[in-house]
Interface confidence: low
């Protein structure tokens, strides 16, 4: 039959060439002389001339060594024709399979691989995967089957078998416990890839394994005991800098310290913060310490890290003995701010109150008093007793010095310590109103027509407080009532001034007496300009000049 089974040819054949592979034969050769030829890639198309056929015998010839990694299979067509060139057979498919030889070494995809793994991980933890390729056949032969192995490990601490590599996948895993970044932060593994599933050619590469930091070292106080001296009353005062050492990676959360006062600070007098650069614990006073109440504090401070510990570690504790130093403390007025009610206008020399200070120091110090700020100069203070008396006229209505009925005075207490210290107190005098002001009309100048005049509405003001104000009463005096009339409107505290009789154009004085609910009377002279006009006027018109 005009059929050829697939032909297997090993690559890299040594010849001699041409080498006979197989014979094409047509059974039509009994009837006529047959000529054979082949076509296809490797014969008459690129790569031309690899194969040929003996024209008359049909022997298929190989002209040169084959390379499987270049072309693994050739598909040719065999042709049979008679002497006159007529085709005697259909083209026949010829398959030539190039069989593999182990002519390639494995190749790693990188010269150096990098990976990382946390320190302290359990054996079995995967680190990284390395890959090597081999161009040889790994399906039908073991020529291209790569087996991975670790040739060496540097450094060999804590021993030389810290890692293993999966023979067929190239996955590097931890095989031993004891990875400690603080001792060895990086390993260099020389890895091998061997073909023939481990029995053939070998190539090497490097795998660098970085050991990442875990919080497996606790911060430790160094030293553990401290003594400090702090002046009493100082707030925000730096008491002590506590120092710790931590073997974990500097500036990482596993290294950064967190401090906590765990004992000895019942009054919440202290606070501790971590210095961002030095990692020290900065112990400061949150409140002022009181020598007289407690002259020594013993604090206990614990340190941990920002990151939690990955294993159970002992917590380091520091002891800080804080000695409170006595300072001459300022006298303190009791109360710091004193409110006293006093009637305005009381006579000079009359007592207002006694305002004294206490000295926190244990010694009985002498305190002297004086007025520090008395804007109107209304008060005096006895330096020994702290007695405050009137030295001027207290005027509730004086808006320069009095706000909302209150007159504010600052007083000073000075002790006889060395050096002397001073304390201040605030005396708030609430001035009680007396009916010392009569009602006053506004405005005090008016303009009005002498024909069909508009009534003038004047506002009534009284600086005193109720009940020394409205209802008001009005009265015209000094014959002003002959031409004028004044009526109080109680609803809006106004007085309506009207012209009763004709007056020629001129300026007149209207004598208006207003009295308040407490009968405090006030006479006001209103300047009235009367104009020759009708009804409403703002300003007198110019006299008419005939032409």
């Amino acid at each position: 039959d005009w059929v050829v089974a697939p032909i297997s040819v090993p690559e890299n054949g040594k010849g001699p060439f041409p080498q006979r592979l197989n014979q094409l034969k047509s059974n039509k050769d009994r009837d006529t002389k047959i000529f054979y030829s082949i076509t296809g890639p490797g014969a008459d198309s690129p790569p031309e001339g690899v194969f040929a056929v003996e024209k008359e015998t049909g022997w298929l010839l190989l002209n040169k060594p084959l390379d499987r990694e270049e072309i693994a299979k050739y598909e040719l067509f065999g042709h049979a024709v008679s002497e006159n060139g007529a085709s005697v057979e259909d083209p026949m498919n010829i398959s030539i399979i190039v069989t593999d030889q182990n002519d390639h070494k494995p190749k790693f995809t990188q010269d150096t691989f990098r990976g990382s793994v946390l320190e302290g991980v359990l054996p079995g933890t995967s680190v990284m995967q390395v890959t090597a390729t081999d161009e040889d056949d790994a399906i039908h032969t073991y020529n291209g089957v790569v087996a991975y192995s670790i040739h060496s490990q540097e450094p060999k601490d804590p021993h030389d078998l810290m890692f293993t590599i999966h023979r067929s996948t190239g996955t590097i895993s931890v095989i031993s416990s004891g990875l400690d970044r603080e001792k060895v932060p990086e390993y260099t593994l020389t890895i091998q890839a061997t073909d023939m599933d481990g029995d053939g050619s070998t190539t090497t590469a490097v795998a660098v394994v970085e050991i990442l930091d875990a919080n497996d070292n606790a911060p430790v106080f160094d030293p553990q005991k401290y003594e400090s001296h702090v002046p009493e009353n100082a707030v925000g005062h730096e008491v002590q800098r506590l120092t710790v050492t931590d073997l974990d990676a500097p500036n990482s959360p596993a290294w950064r310290a967190t401090y906590l006062i765990v004992g000895g600070d019942d009054g919440d007098h202290f606070t501790i913060a971590t210095h961002p650069e030095s990692n020290q614990g900065i112990l400061t006073t949150r409140k002022g310490l009181d020598f007289e109440a407690k002259n020594q504090h013993t604090l206990y401070v614990e340190v941990t890290n920002e990151a939690p510990f990955v294993l159970k570690l002992p917590t380091s504790t520091a002891t800080i003995v804080v000695h409170v130093e006595d300072v001459n403390e300022a006298p303190v007025f009791v109360p710091p701010s004193k409110v006293v009610e006093v009637q305005e206008g009381i006579p000079t020399g009359e007592a207002v109150c006694v305002y004294t200070a206490k000295d926190p120091d244990k010694e009985n110090q002498k305190i002297s008093y004086r007025i520090l700020r008395d804007p109107a100069g209304w008060l005096a203070m006895d330096p020994d007793s702290g007695q405050v008396t009137v030295a001027g006229t207290l005027d509730r209505e004086d808006e320069r010095f009095v706000r909302n009925n209150i007159y504010e005075v600052m007083v000073l207490a000075v002790d006889n310590g060395s050096p002397p210290t001073t304390g201040t107190g605030t005396l708030l005098l609430t001035l009680i109103d007396v009916n010392d002001h009569g009602p006053v009309p506004e405005p005090r100048e008016i303009t009005i027509c002498n024909q069909s005049p508009e009534s003038q509405v004047l506002n009534i003001t009284d600086k005193d407080l109720s009940p020394h104000t409205s209802p008001f009463q009005a009265q015209l005096t000094d014959d002003s009532d002959i031409y004028w009339m004044a009526e109080v409107n109680e609803k809006d505290d106004t007085v309506v001034l009207s012209l009763k009789k004709f007056l020629k154009q001129d300026t007149y004085d209207v004598h208006l007496s207003l009295s308040d609910h407490g009968n405090k009377e006030q006479l006001t002279v209103i300047r009235a300009t009367v104009c020759d006009c009708h009804g409403h006027v703002e300003k007198c018109p110019d006299p008419w000049k005939g032409g």
């Epitope: 990098r114 990382s116 450094p155 400690d180």
Partner: antibody, heavy 123, light 113 residues
């Protein structure tokens, strides 16, 4: 201010052991890795090895059989020992601090160097 | 070992002009996980230790003038001095820290033309 200072004998006989110390000030000795580098007169730089913050070491394979790097935390000092020296070991020897302990700090780059000490190997 | 090759071996540039030094590694210094190139540049003046200028191939060390810049990735790197000053006369070295042992280039001597 971080400072590194190398010290040791300026002259060593062939086949003897070269011993140098590196004194570190201005930073905790256990906070950063320390490298040793050498430079033969008129030539380039050669990395000798590194000691990590926890005491582990990595050495240049070309010198590994002869070199030892160690630390004495009580004295704030690192030491370099190179055995069986020959004239080819004549060089200025430097100690240098790595930028950090982490790979991501660029720990292979060296930011602070000592002034260096010249060691001559001669009989 | 990774071999570092610098070019040129020496270079003469006029004051105020640009100076360029090249460094080639025998294998890639780019680590795919963090996309960083493990390369540093140093300056060494006569009688002094080397001074770190650049790390991660392009990050300037604090205190280094901004006329110094580093570029490149993989196997090809460049140190550029944008406007040469008299005090820049020195030998410049590149160094890889991708894998052990750390290795340096042979150095480039920079002079004023």
């Amino acid at each position: 201010q971080v400072q590194l200072q190398e010290s040791g004998p300026g002259l060593v006989k062939p086949s003897e052991t070269l011993s140098l110390t590196c004194t570190v000030s201005g930073v905790s000795i256990t906070s950063y890795p320390i490298n040793w580098i050498r430079q033969p007169p008129g030539k380039g730089l050669e990395w000798i090895g590194v000691i990590w913050t926890g005491g582990g070491t990595n050495y240049n394979p070309s010198l590994k059989s002869r070199v030892t790097i160690s630390v004495d935390t009580s004295k704030n000092q690192f030491s370099l020992k190179l055995s069986s020296v020959t004239a080819a070991d004549t060089a200025v020897y430097y100690c240098a601090r790595s930028r950090g302990v982490y790979d991501f700090d660029g720990r292979g780059a060296m930011d602070y160097w000592g002034q260096g000490t010249l060691v001559t190997v001669s009989s | 070992d990774i071999v570092m090759t610098q070019s040129p071996a020496s270079l003469a540039v006029s004051l105020g002009e640009r100076a360029t030094i090249n460094c080639k590694s025998s294998q890639s210094l780019l680590y795919s996980s963090n996309q960083k190139n493990y390369l540093a540049w140093y300056q060494q003046k006569p009688g002094q230790p080397p001074k770190l200028l650049i790390y991660w191939a392009s990050t300037r060390e604090s205190g280094v003038p901004d006329r110094f810049s580093g570029s490149g990735s993989g196997t090809d790197f460049t140190l550029t001095i944008s406007s040469l000053q008299a005090e820049d006369v020195a030998v410049y070295y590149c160094q890889q820290y991708y894998s052990y042992p750390y290795t340096f280039g042979q150095g480039t001597k920079l002079e004023i033309k």
